[in-house]
Interface confidence: low
């Protein structure tokens, strides 16, 4: 199922973060929090679904704690008072590692998936429609927070004007040989014009259903591979594409292609057998010259989750991995609107695609 007309994502927001959930929580809304647990001495982080910004009314407090072997606390706070904790004595997060955390709002509960696996259900203690804010705090760095509204609505025109809630900017291209350490992208008023999010459905009308077996055995609802889909409206300056997934433990290679007809305008090809991230363009079945330079070590790791963020600008594509700028790729095919197909294949499992 695809989701269009959804709230634009918050991109690389600073932590602590509080942001509005446009229209509040609704049955079927899926919210994805993608980031990395910091390696620092902090032992906790939290994602809160709350009313307003005060923190006194939190419908769902999701609180991983790297303490006592690791566990996750779920709770509700009403008028400043916490209710009884629900503890999950399993820690699906690792310090220093990226994660993909999905919350599905359903009529009776929140379902929480971590890296594609159903982790916990939290039954509503207060009406979820009161929630209008998401907040994140603690020992975590965020890549993005995205929203997937399941209502099938007419797709927006390719140049509608939904702005980024927190827009994106890549660091300027370095002039010297040495590149500065990459950071989180600061703000830039580039508008996002359309969001289409692809997810895997387990049953009609819902993202994943209550499993018939204990939650920890619930398998990854994986995107079939290769995954190929249309980029509505093609590329244009400010167009953003987000992907997240997990590299298979025995991975050799995978690819993300942006295609125009029979041409591959942009081929992003992490190669674990060569410890390289190869970029290239294929026109009429002929490959051009490869680009391999990186400002830091190979960001993709076998067996680990990742997020890739591709931002189209007038002269180049800018690519970030796990919220950190990685490289620029100057357009070789310049008819951007014709670059309208995304192909992902190889040794990964996709958990989230947003075009």
């Amino acid at each position: 199922m695809a989701f269009s007309g959804s709230q634009a994502p918050y991109l690389s927001p600073a932590v602590p973060f509080s942001g509005t959930i446009q229209g509040g929580l609704q049955d079927g809304l899926q919210i994805t929090v993608n980031g990395t647990v910091l390696s620092s001495s902090g032992t906790r982080f939290a994602v809160n679904f709350q009313t307003g910004f005060s923190g006194n009314d939190i419908a769902f407090h999701f609180n991983p704690r790297f303490e006592d072997g690791g566990y996750v606390v779920c709770n509700t706070r009403q008028n400043g008072s916490w209710g009884p904790e629900e503890r999950k004595t399993h820690m699906p997060f690792q310090k220093g590692m990226p994660f993909d955390l999905c919350f599905l709002v359903q009529s009776s509960d929140f379902k929480v998936m971590v890296n594609g696996i159903l982790f916990v259900q939290y039954f509503h203690r207060v009406p979820f429609h009161r929630v209008d804010t998401i907040s994140v705090n603690g020992s975590v760095q965020l890549s993005y927070i995205s929203f997937q509204n399941p209502r099938t609505v007419p797709v927006q025109p390719a140049f509608s004007t939904v702005p980024f809630s927190q827009p994106v900017c890549f660091p300027p291209r370095p002039r010297g040989r040495r590149q500065k350490p990459p950071g989180v992208w600061p703000a830039n008023p580039a508008p996002i014009t359309q969001t289409v999010i692809h997810t895997v459905q387990s049953a009609p009308g819902q993202m994943f259903s209550t499993p018939a077996i204990p939650p920890m055995m619930y398998p990854h609802p994986a995107y079939p591979m290769p995954f190929i889909t249309t980029i509505l409206g093609g590329l244009y300056p400010s167009k953003s594409i987000l992907l997240s997934g997990t590299v298979l433990p025995s991975a050799q290679r995978f690819h993300i292609n942006l295609c125009s007809g029979n041409h591959i305008a942009f081929h992003l090809n992490p190669r674990f057998d060569e410890n390289a991230v190869v970029r290239n363009t294929q026109i009429d079945n002929s490959w051009g010259s490869e680009e391999r330079s990186l400002p830091r070590k190979m960001p993709f790791v076998r067996g680990q989750s990742f997020s890739v963020w591709i931002l189209c600008e007038a002269h180049c594509l800018k690519v970030a991995v796990d919220g950190q700028h990685l490289f620029e790729y100057y357009h070789r095919l310049r008819n951007l609107p014709t670059i309208n197909r995304l192909e992902v294949g190889g040794d990964i499992q996709l958990t989230h695609v947003q075009t």
Partner: antibody
Framework: EVQLVESGGGLVQPGGSLRLSCAAS????????IHWVRQAPGKGLEWVAY????????SYADSVKGRFTISADTSKNTAYLQMNSLRAEDTAVYYC????????????????????WGQGTLVTVSS | DIQMTQSPSSLSASVGDRVTITCRAS??????VAWYQQKPGKAPKLLIY???SLYSGVPSRFSGSRSGTDFTLTISSLQPEDFATYYC???????????FGQGTKVEIK
């Protein structure tokens, strides 16, 4: 038009070998998942093997593991099934099929199944 | 390996009948289940993919549904051309082989 055409079947003695071919047209084998499925006379469908040439990944049913080898020649847009140490119970019609994951209309739907099949080729193992 | 237990193995029905065929997976396979129709001497044809999505060109009288690990193929009003054998198949093959159900032969009553 997508088409799959198998060839290479025939009569072979137990312990012998055969190589089946699956010539594809209308799509590229290199970025597709190609499967072999067999059907013994009067029996149901049994999955045999698949290959995803892009990442050189493949998998086999336990019943053929170590005896059958799946491969692909992307320049010929053809997949192969090399069958060694054949047994009487390998007698079947062998189909190749494309496991498709293409979206339709750009709105995130995909085919999660084998959408195109060949006509089948009969392999008979008998002395 | 994931087993797909299909039932019934055969059934007799008349034109216009509503027919239901069930497959139960031995463990969760998400919605990675497809249904095929096969006629004698022919290759199978895809009917339903992802448990409930109707494949292109397949008549709307065919439908699929999922409840936990149970998957159902329904023919709302059986037509003469629907007499065939039907197979379910789980496609969760990253870590498990693909497996088919044993098949259900739909015969004329």
């Amino acid at each position: 038009e997508v088409q799959l055409v198998e060839s290479g079947g025939g009569l072979v003695q137990p312990g012998g070998s055969l190589r089946l071919s699956c010539a594809a047209s209308g799509f590229t084998v290199s970025s597709s998942s190609i499967h072999w499925v067999r059907q013994a006379p009067g029996k149901g469908l049994e999955w045999v093997a698949y290959i995803y040439p892009y990442s050189s990944s493949s998998s086999y049913a336990d019943s053929v593991k170590g005896r059958f080898t799946i491969s692909a020649d992307t320049s010929k847009n053809t997949a192969y099934l090399q069958m060694n140490s054949l047994r009487a119970e390998d007698t079947a019609v062998y189909y190749c099929a494309r496991y498709s994951t293409y979206s339709w209309g750009g709105i995130g739907k995909w085919v999660w199944g084998m959408d195109y099949w060949g006509q089948g080729t009969l392999v008979t193992v008998s002395s | 390996d994931i087993q797909m237990t299909q039932s019934p193995s055969s059934l007799s029905a008349s034109v216009g009948d509503r027919v239901t065929i069930t497959c139960r997976a031995s463990q969760s396979v998400s919605s990675a289940v497809a249904w095929y129709q096969q006629k004698p001497g022919k290759a199978p044809k895809l009917l339903i993919y992802s448990a409930s999505s109707l494949y292109s060109g397949v008549p709307s009288r065919f439908s699929g549904s999922r409840s936990g690990t149970d998957f159902t193929l329904t023919i709302s009003s059986l037509q003469p051309e629907d007499f065939a054998t039907y197979y379910c198949q789980q496609s969760y093959y990253d870590s498990n082989p693909i497996t088919f159900g044993q098949g259900t032969k739909v015969e004329i009553k």
